[in-house]
């Protein structure tokens, strides 16, 4: 169905944008509070959205040092913004078998961001591999 695939595309383009925000934050990793955060890795199939929400819930914080505080806080806020809802996301919400956020290994900000980026890339890969050839236009 064309409109639902366009909605999915728009949703994945948002994921694509999140990767750039993660990359931006990686530049300021020394200005983040060096706290250990749950960082899902090797996420099992159908638990991607659950893992995604774990990354969004994590308390990534600026160390409030230097003049990078504003860009860091804006970037973190954008990472936490709720993405548009999709059927895939709704379906996965009903899976009770996905690990809880606390069960994931905790990592410092650098590895946390790297793992977040890997998950986003995996989700985009799954989306692009499952759709027919054609444009990402909306």
């Amino acid at each position: 169905h064309k409109s639902s695939s366009q909605g999915q595309d728009r949703h994945m383009i948002r994921m694509r944008q999140l990767i750039d925000i993660v990359d931006q934050l990686k530049n300021y990793v020394n200005d983040l509070v060096p706290e250990f955060l749950p960082a899902p890795e090797d996420v099992e199939t159908n638990c991607e959205w659950s893992a995604f929400s774990c990354f969004q819930k994590a308390q990534l914080k600026s160390a409030n040092t230097g003049n990078n505080e504003r860009i860091i806080n804006v970037s973190i806020k954008k990472l936490k913004r709720k993405p548009p809802s999709t059927n895939a996301g709704r379906r996965q919400k009903h899976r009770l078998t996905c690990p809880s956020c606390d069960s994931y290994e905790k990592k410092p900000p650098k590895e946390f961001l790297e793992r977040f980026k890997s998950l986003l890339q995996k989700m985009i890969h799954q989306h692009l591999s499952s759709r027919t050839h054609g444009s990402e236009d909306s």
Partner: antibody, heavy 116, light 107 residues
């Protein structure tokens, strides 16, 4: 259909600033980030940075940080790229490009010539 | 920054020829590789995104393949309108970077 229409050619003196505009149409302006890329005469393409038109969030290339400012006007679906402290090496064609999964639509380019 | 090395930098070919352009990244870019076409005085056009996905309106004679660090753009049967410069670009990591370009000229 998606269209990106850029402002006309500019001639500037070294040390001056230039502001290039890029008017978008044919899609929801705030759904897609806009990137800026430049091309010096006879050279390849160089990425300058990107702006999220929904909230004016920007990411700039280290090569231009401190000299480039990207802004937007949602009422006219236009993004702007301002480059300051111009030098002769900034002579180039400047492109805006919409970013979906890639830079899927590009403006026609704006030639900026820096000459004393 | 991720470096992209395109080869060849230029090539001469005839209409109907099969043309292959390669792009090598300095690190694994996980298929986040796009191809563009540029003609003098014209807007740049996206041909292929995410290694092998054909952008809308792009003829099927264009195809892309690759993984890891090595990627290829193939034009199965070169047409007169295909004489242009082609660029690869990685979308894996900021900053966005482009290959040096490959100019396809008429033999």
């Amino acid at each position: 259909q998606v269209q990106l229409v850029q402002s006309g050619a500019e001639v500037k003196k070294p040390g001056a600033s230039v502001k290039v505009s890029c008017k978008a149409s044919g899609y929801t302006f705030t759904d897609y980030w806009m990137h800026w890329v430049r091309q010096a005469p006879g050279q390849g393409l160089e990425w300058m940075g990107t702006i999220d038109p929904s909230d004016q969030y920007t990411i700039y290339s280290q090569n231009f940080k401190g000299r480039v400012t990207m802004t937007r006007d949602t009422s006219t679906s236009t993004v702007y790229m301002e480059l300051s402290s111009l030098r002769s090496e900034d002579t180039a064609v400047y492109y805006c490009a919409r970013y979906g999964f890639a830079m899927d639509y590009w403006g026609q380019g704006t030639l900026v010539t820096v000459s004393s | 920054d991720i470096q992209l090395t395109q080869s060849p930098s230029s090539l001469s070919a005839s209409v109907g020829d099969r043309v292959t352009i390669t792009c090598r990244a300095s690190q694994d870019i996980s298929n986040f590789l796009n191809w563009y076409q540029q003609k003098p005085g014209k807007a740049v056009k996206l041909l292929i995104y995410y290694t092998s996905r054909l952008h809308s309106g792009v003829p099927s004679r264009f195809s892309g393949s690759g993984s890891g660090t090595d990627y290829t753009l193939t034009i199965s049967s070169l047409q007169p309108e295909d004489f242009a410069t082609y660029y690869c670009q990685q979308g894996h990591t900021l900053p966005r970077t482009f290959g040096g370009g490959t100019k396809v000229e008429i033999k």
